[in-house]
Structures are given as structure tokens and as C-alpha cells.
């Protein structure tokens, strides 16, 4: 069947449309196009006789039509009047006629719309606003957008006039948004520029900042007022009901107690005609005195004296606070506060109690701090230390010994050699020493304030020959894979080289072996049972050398997984069962046996005479090393068969 398809069906003014012919019969004489739904010579657009290759325009021809050999008709530069039906009249070679009708609709390209408003400055909770989308256009659909979103569902929003008018009832400040309208028809869509709704509102109840209402005499009072309002509010300040100034901020420098009172901020909106006020009560306090600390003991002795610190002056109904080292007071049985917190007592002071200490007086506004106080705790002297630590010297060198003992006030020092007083200095110096200078060197430290004295004695040997060294150890029984051992070669001697041997060999290269302290210390990390060897240290200088006796490292290890022997697991009835358990361990482990989970005996060997099939089962050997705290075990299954049925064992 002959049909006409309009491409497109909805056409924009100024564009073109193709009336496309489908199922055109063969063997045609010609065809004609007509405007309308029927063949009417007065409304012929164009006619075409096949073979002439020339079309004949009709009365309805506008010059915008192009006819094609396949009978399709193109209409260019479409106008509104072109809307409607078009009929194709086909004449076949047998002069039989056929007709088909198509249609299209013409729509204008829409202009860019604009929004008109009936109220440019609506008042919140009072006015309504009607937006209208201009211009009014036939066959157009109207849409609205708020902040580029489609309209929210709201009983205050109403569309009317074919959606061309958007009414907002009882506007609120939240309706201050970007509004756009859009016009649509089948061929175009255009969106307006945005219109911002300017809702007048407020003022809301003003807020006064800052919120604090208590001030100290001498401070500056700076109050700021703000109220949500459109247009912005005009502000006025009243103090105790008396007008002060028309500003958003109120500033009063160097206030006194007389500035206490009620401060009112009034916000006014000239467009809405509304006023709102907020009142705050300001209290100005007199400045309190700066506190200070008194002490009942300015030079307390460590571990003997107590000290009472008192915060002055005494003021009724006042809170006293204390700080030590800029921290609040630590919890300690040696710190005691009086009932009113004004006195802090330190019981049995130590050198660590020096402070600084601060006290504070708290009033309504702030805390006033005292200046810091530092305690002068008398202590010591502690046991003096003599340096350097060398005990062996060669003849001809200088001996220079220094003594130090922690003490407050600093200690006074005296030196004695073999009990004879030498000098009252911190350092002892003897040049070009000889063997005669060997002896006991005593440093005595004395604290004149506490009256205490402490001494330290050091044996000095002056000899060309080095002494026989010895090895000291920090761990006599290290546990395998757990402990480290540090061997130190004694004594410490000046200008001496330290050497080490293991089992008569020089030290092997190993990441677990480390030399330190001028090679005087040998550390073995993560000891193993293989480290249980003979260790020897040696010392040498330019005139002599000496070696220590060997020290054998006793490494505790195990118990390893035990082994049960013999390995046999099948026995004949009547045979003797003699199982021996062994586990590598240092010290030797304790052994115990279980048969089928039942404890038996605490021996290394398990003996059962003349076994029977009743002796079938699991035999477990348990080993434990009390020194390493480790345990281990193994289980063996024993099968006893009746006489003569064993697969290969005989009694």
C-alpha cells in the first residue's frame, strides 16, 4: 500500500521536511502532489510525467519544494502555514489512480523566555509572589526550576495559567533562590536567565557576642551584635535603658565596677519595619591582688626535712590552686594540701622536689598566678666515683684521678693514699709514677651543709708487667635461642690491647659475635648450644702480654624431641619390653612415661617383663628441663602378638 512518511513529523520553522514515499508502484505514468487531504487542482503543488524529466509547478507551488524521481517531496524553509496534510496522486501506466496522504506539524523555534514578577521585594511570612514566564506562546509547555532542580513538592508552591505562572504563598527566607522557567514545544526548548528572589525578613532576635558576662576592672569591653535580617539590620545600644550609640559594635575601654549593668542591643529592619532586642547583664569585678608563695624552710635536707609552702594573701571564699613543673599536682603520699588548699606540704623532700612551684587564686573570671618558687634541697654527697676506671698503670706515666659525688651544695673533696691525707682537691695528680705509687687511693666527699661524708677506695697498681686477666660474665647460665652473654676482660688497664680466643682459635666471623668497649667486651647474641666452648681473653702492651684462664660457657638448652630405642614396634607375647628414652638437654632432663595416657614411672628406662597382648598400646616418653622451663615428648605404638603369629620377630 502506498504510504507517506514525514521526516520529521514535528518541524521547526525555517527547517525542512521530507515527505518520503513508500511502496511506490512500478510502471508509472506520473504523479502530482497536493496541499490538503484530497486531489484539488487549485491546490496542486507540482506534477511530474515520467519520461519528460520536467516537473510542472501548480498553483500551490512556493519555490521551496523539490520533487525527486522517487516521488518524494522536500519542502525547505518551512513556515507555519505549511502545517497540515499533503496528498500524493499517482497515475499508473494502465491509467489506474492511487492516492496516499501524509502530514506534518510546524512549530516555531521558541524565543528565550524571561520571568516577570508581581513583587520584587516580598516580606517573609506575609507576602506571596507570582512569577510569570514570558512570552505566552501557543502549543508550548512551561516548566520551572529552583536552583537548577525541578520544583519541590510544597503546599506553598502553586502552578497556574497552564503552568506559565508559579506562585509562592507566604514566602520565607529559604525561598531566596535562583528561579528559571523553560518553554518547550516538540521542536525546541529554551530556558530563561535566572531570577533571584529577594525575600525581606527579620530582624531575628539579635545575638550579642562574646557570650561571657564577667569582666575584670581595667579590661576593655567590646560587644558585637548580630541579627539575621534582609536588608541588613540597623543597630542601637542601650546601657541600663539609656541610649548609647547606633553601631553594630559597642566599645568601652578600661572598664570599672561602675560599668556593670544591663546592655541592650536593638536591631531594626527599615523595609519590614520590625524591631527586636536582646539584653545581656555585664558584671565588672575589682582586680584581686597577685598571689605569692612563702616557705617555712628555704634549705631543706633530703630525706630529713618537710617543707610547707603557703599561698599568700589569705582571702575569704577564694579557691587556691597549685602547680608543680607547670603541671597540676601529681598524686603522691608525700604531698599534702591543707583544708583550704592554701598550704602545700612536701613530706621528706628529695632532690627531685626542686619545682618550680606556683600557686593561683581563682576568681569569677580567671586565675591569677604567683611567680614561680624553686626549692633549694640539700642532698648528698652520694658515693663518689673515681675516673678514669683504670687500675693498672705503667711506671713513668702521669697519674691523674678525678673524683665526683652528686651533692648540694657541691661537695668538698679530700684524697688519701694508703690512709694518709694528701690534698683537699677534686683532682689528684702525680707525675712520673713508679711501683712505689701502688696502693689504696681514697676519695672523701663532704657536704658542709648536711654534715654528711662518703668515701670510695680504688686500688692502683703500678707495674711494667700486666697482671693475669680474668673473664667476668653477665649471665652464667644463658638459655639457647633466648639469651645474650657479655664477657668482659678484667682489669681495665691504660694503653692496653684486648684479644679473645674461642677453643684456642681467634674469633670466628659471625653476626652473633660483637666486640665493644675497646675490644674489652665480647657479646654473644642468641646463644646456641654450639657456643658452649672455652673462652680466653688476653691483654698486651708494649712490654708484656698475659692470658686469662679459660671460661667455659654453660648454655642451657633442650629438651629436644626425645628418641625411644629400640625402634621396634612389634613384639611376641612373653618377651621382655625394655624401652630407653633419650633427649639432648642441658642440664639433663627429667624423664617420665605414660602407657595409653596413664602415668607410669619417672625413669629414663621403662622395663616390663613377659609382655602379653594386654600390653598393646601407645607408649609416651615425656622430658622436661627445669632450667630452660621447656618440655617435649614422643609417642610410640607397641603391638604384642600371641606366640607364633609374629610376622618376623622372635623372643
Amino acid at each position: 500500500k502506498l504510504t507517506i512518511e514525514s521526516t520529521p513529523f514535528n518541524v521547526a520553522e525555517g527547517k525542512e521536511v521530507l515527505l518520503l514515499v513508500h511502496n511506490l508502484p512500478q510502471h508509472l505514468f506520473g504523479y502530482s502532489w497536493y496541499k490538503g487531504e484530497r486531489v484539488d487542482g487549485n491546490r496542486q503543488i507540482i506534477g511530474y510525467v515520467i519520461g519528460t524529466q520536467q516537473a510542472t509547478p501548480g498553483p500551490a507551488y512556493s519555490g521551496r519544494e523539490i520533487i525527486y524521481p522517487n516521488a518524494s517531496l522536500l519542502i525547505q524553509n518551512i513556515i507555519q502555514n505549511d502545517t497540515g496534510f499533503y496528498t500524493l496522486h499517482v497515475i499508473k501506466s494502465d491509467l489506474v489512480n492511487e492516492e496516499a496522504t501524509g502530514q506534518f506539524r510546524v512549530y516555531p523555534e521558541l524565543p528565550k523566555p524571561s520571568i516577570s514578577s508581581n513583587n520584587s521585594k516580598p516580606v517573609e511570612d506575609k507576602d506571596a509572589v507570582a512569577f510569570t514566564c514570558e512570552p505566552e506562546t501557543q502549543d508550548a509547555t512551561y516548566l520551572w526550576w529552583v536552583n537548577n532542580q525541578s520544583l519541590p513538592v510544597s503546599p506553598r508552591l502553586q502552578l497556574s495559567n497552564g503552568n506559565r505562572t508559579l506562585t509562592l504563598f507566604n514566602v520565607t527566607r529559604n525561598d531566596t533562590a535562583s528561579y528559571k522557567c523553560e518553554t518547550q514545544n516538540p521542536v525546541s526548548a529554551r530556558r530563561s536567565d535566572s531570577v533571584i528572589l529577594n525575600v525581606l525578613y527579620g530582624p531575628d532576635a539579635p545575638t550579642i557576642s562574646p557570650l561571657n558576662t564577667s569582666y575584670r576592672s581595667g579590661e576593655n569591653l567590646n560587644l558585637s551584635c548580630h541579627a539575621a535580617s534582609n536588608p541588613p539590620a540597623q543597630y542601637s545600644w542601650f546601657v541600663n535603658g539609656t541610649f548609647q550609640q547606633s553601631t553594630q559594635e559597642l566599645f568601652i575601654p578600661n572598664i570599672t565596677v561602675n560599668n556593670s549593668g544591663s546592655y541592650t542591643c536593638q536591631a531594626h529592619n527599615s523595609d519590614t519595619g520590625l524591631n527586636r532586642t536582646t539584653v545581656t547583664t555585664i558584671t565588672v569585678y575589682a582586680e584581686p591582688p597577685k598571689p605569692f608563695i612563702t616557705s617555712n624552710n628555704s634549705n631543706p635536707v633530703e630525706d630529713e626535712d618537710a617543707v610547707a609552702l603557703t599561698c599568700e594573701p589569705e582571702i575569704q571564699n577564694t579557691t587556691y590552686l597549685w602547680w608543680v613543673n607547670n603541671q597540676s599536682l601529681p598524686v603522691s603520699p608525700r604531698l599534702q594540701l591543707s583544708n583550704d588548699n592554701r598550704t602545700l606540704t612536701l613530706l621528706s623532700v628529695t632532690r627531685n622536689d626542686v619545682g618550680p612551684y606556683e600557686c593561683g587564686i581563682q576568681n569569677e573570671l580567671s586565675v591569677d598566678h604567683s611567680d614561680p618558687v624553686i626549692l633549694n634541697v640539700l642532698y648528698g654527697p652520694d658515693d663518689p666515683t673515681i675516673s678514669p676506671s683504670y687500675t693498672y698503670y705503667r711506671p713513668g706515666v702521669n697519674l691523674s684521678l678525678s673524683c665526683h659525688a652528686a651533692s648540694n651544695p657541691p661537695a668538698q673533696y679530700s684524697w688519701l693514699i694508703d690512709g694518709n691525707i694528701q690534698q683537699h682537691t677534686q683532682e689528684l695528680f702525680i707525675s712520673n709514677i713508679t711501683e712505689k705509687n701502688s696502693g689504696l687511693y681514697t676519695c672523701q666527699a663532704n657536704n658542709s651543709a648536711s654534715g654528711h661524708s662518703r668515701t670510695t677506695v680504688k686500688t692502683i697498681t703500678v707495674s711494667a708487667e700486666l697482671p693475669k686477666p680474668s673473664i667476668s660474665s653477665n649471665n652464667s647460665k644463658p638459655v639457647e635461642d633466648k639469651d645474650a652473654v657479655a664477657f668482659t676482660c678484667e682489669p681495665e688497664a691504660q694503653n692496653t690491647t684486648y684479644l679473645w680466643w674461642v677453643n684456642g682459635q681467634s674469633l670466628p666471623v659471625s653476626p652473633r659475635l660483637q666486640l665493644s668497649n675497646g675490644n674489652r667486651t665480647l657479646t654473644l647474641f642468641n646463644v646456641t648450644r654450639n657456643d658452649a666452648r672455652a673462652y680466653v681473653c688476653g691483654i698486651q702492651n708494649s712490654v708484656s702480654a698475659n692470658r686469662s684462664d679459660p671460661v667455659t660457657l654453660d648454655v642451657l638448652y633442650g629438651p629436644d624431641t626425645p628418641i625411644i630405642s629400640p625402634p621396634d614396634s612389634s613384639y611376641l607375647s612373653g618377651a621382655n619390653l625394655n624401652l630407653s628414652c633419650h633427649s639432648a638437654s642441658n642440664p639433663s632432663p627429667q624423664y617420665s612415661w605414660r602407657i595409653n595416657g596413664i602415668p607410669q614411672q619417672h625413669t629414663q628406662v621403662l622395663f616390663i617383663a613377659k609382655i602379653t597382648p594386654n600390653n598393646n598400646g601407645t607408649y609416651a616418653c615425656f622430658v622436661s628441663n627445669l632450667a630452660t622451663g621447656r618440655n617435649n615428648s614422643i609417642v610410640k605404638s607397641i603391638t604384642v602378638s600371641a606366640s607364633g603369629t609374629s610376622p618376623g620377630l622372635s623372643a
Epitope: 515520467i50 519520461g51 524529466q53 520536467q54 516537473a55 519555490g63 521551496r64 523539490i66 525527486y68 524521481p69
Partner: antibody
Framework: QIQLVQSGPELKKPGETVKISCKAS????????MNWVKQAPGKGLKWMGW????????TYPDDFKGRFAFSLETSATTAYLQINNLKNEDTATYFC???????????WGQGTTLTVSS | DIQMTQSPSSLSASLGGKVTITCKAS??????ISWYQHKPGKGPRLLIH???TLQSGIPSRFSGSGSGRDYSFSISNLEPEDIATYYC????????FGGGTKLEIK
């Protein structure tokens, strides 16, 4: 796209015959008539007539009856202009042009220059 | 045969200006007139048909009007690429070109 490609320039003597070709592509050759247009040096355009590519029937205006002949090779989608007994005044550029069904000359060849000189 | 008288045969105008060419037919041609632009070495280009209908892709600077025997063609806002010879063509009965108008830019 629709294209009309004409044969190259010709140099002839008076009394000779020339045959200019116009090869069409990009459309159904037998749906549209083919026109021929002359432009003598320094002169304007002159319509020489057209040939119905469906029936092969030519049409000539009075000025071009006699020595001028239009022909077709439909299988090759080619139209021809033949001028017999060439004269000096035949010196010109000759254009072929497709005519749509409303006889608008909407597509043109690039032109073929004919020079007739003794 | 129908005769077409085109005037002027040449004219000069300024860039951005406007020019008008006329064609007079020896008899009523029922608006069946088209206008062509012809540049040397190329085939002519169809600008307007049926008196005033712009061919697809032709800028709106070109326009045509007229009826009966008298027709005109205008180019506004002249551009350098408009330099060419312009012809009218009647197609009411057979076809006849006008004599042409050569357009130059001042």
C-alpha cells in the same frame, strides 16, 4: 556526492568535428536531464539545449540547431556534445549541467575549452 | 524564444556595501527565474531559484524578488569572495541566460 567530470581541452581546425564527454556520478543518471551551456571568450553564458536521459530525446533552441548533436552512453552514465563542421566562432568553453525536475541547473561540470583555429 | 536583458553589465562596490542587479524578460515568465554566480575556471553556482528561494547552503546576504517580466537580485554586506560574474536564467519556456553582470570591489 554528485559529480560531473568533462573531457579535456580540444584544439581543432575549421571544418573538423569534436566530441566532448560529460561523465556523471553520485545519482541515478536516467532520472535527470543533461543541459549544455556555451561561454565564448569574454562573453556570457548561452543555453545550448538539453537531452532527456530517460528517452534520449534532445531539445535545441533555434541558435543551436544543425551542427550540434547531444547523445548518451547510458551504461557509462556519460553524455556527449558533438559539433560538426567546426567554425572559428565555436571557440569557447562548454559546460554540461544537470537539470533537476524543476529544470534548475543545480550541478555543473568544470568546463571543456575548445579552440578552433586554422 | 524568450529574451533576458540583464543590467548593468558591470558594477563596482565597496566591501560591506550592497549591490542590485536586474533582469527584464521579453514576456511574463511566471517567477521561473534563477540566479547564478560564475567565477573563472569553475562551473557556475546556483544561488536562487523561483525568483526568491535561496538554494540550500547559500548565505542570506543573497536575495531575489520580482514578478511578471521584472526581476532583481541583491547582495548585501559585500565580502571579497563575492567578486564574480552573476547571471539570471529563465526556465518558464526552455532556458535563456541574461548577458551577465561583472562585480568588482572598489
Amino acid at each position: 556526492q554528485i559529480q560531473l567530470v568533462q573531457s579535456g581541452p580540444e584544439l581543432k581546425k575549421p571544418g573538423e568535428t569534436v566530441k566532448i564527454s560529460c561523465k556523471a556520478s553520485g545519482y541515478t543518471f536516467t532520472d535527470y536531464g543533461m543541459n549544455w551551456v556555451k561561454q565564448a571568450p569574454g562573453k556570457g553564458l548561452k543555453w545550448m539545449g538539453w537531452i532527456n536521459t530517460y528517452t534520449g530525446e534532445p531539445t535545441y533552441p533555434d541558435d543551436f540547431k544543425g551542427r550540434f548533436a547531444f547523445s548518451l552512453e547510458t551504461s557509462a552514465t556519460t553524455a556527449y556534445l558533438q559539433i560538426n563542421n567546426l567554425k572559428n566562432e565555436d571557440t569557447a568553453t562548454y559546460f554540461c549541467s544537470r537539470g533537476d525536475l524543476l529544470v534548475r541547473l543545480d550541478n555543473w561540470g568544470q568546463g571543456t575549452t575548445l579552440t578552433v583555429s586554422s | 524564444d524568450i529574451q533576458m536583458t540583464q543590467s548593468p553589465s558591470s558594477l563596482s562596490a565597496s566591501l560591506g556595501g550592497k549591490v542590485t542587479i536586474t533582469c527584464k524578460a521579453s514576456q511574463d515568465i511566471n517567477k521561473y527565474i534563477s540566479w547564478y554566480q560564475h567565477k573563472p575556471g569553475k562551473g557556475p553556482r546556483l544561488l536562487i531559484h523561483y525568483t526568491s528561494t535561496l538554494q540550500s547552503g547559500i548565505p542570506s546576504r543573497f536575495s531575489g524578488s520580482g514578478s511578471g517580466r521584472d526581476y532583481s537580485f541583491s547582495i548585501s554586506n559585500l565580502e571579497p569572495e563575492d567578486i564574480a560574474t552573476y547571471y539570471c536564467l529563465q526556465y518558464d519556456y526552455l532556458r535563456t541566460f541574461g548577458g551577465g553582470t561583472k562585480l568588482e570591489i572598489k
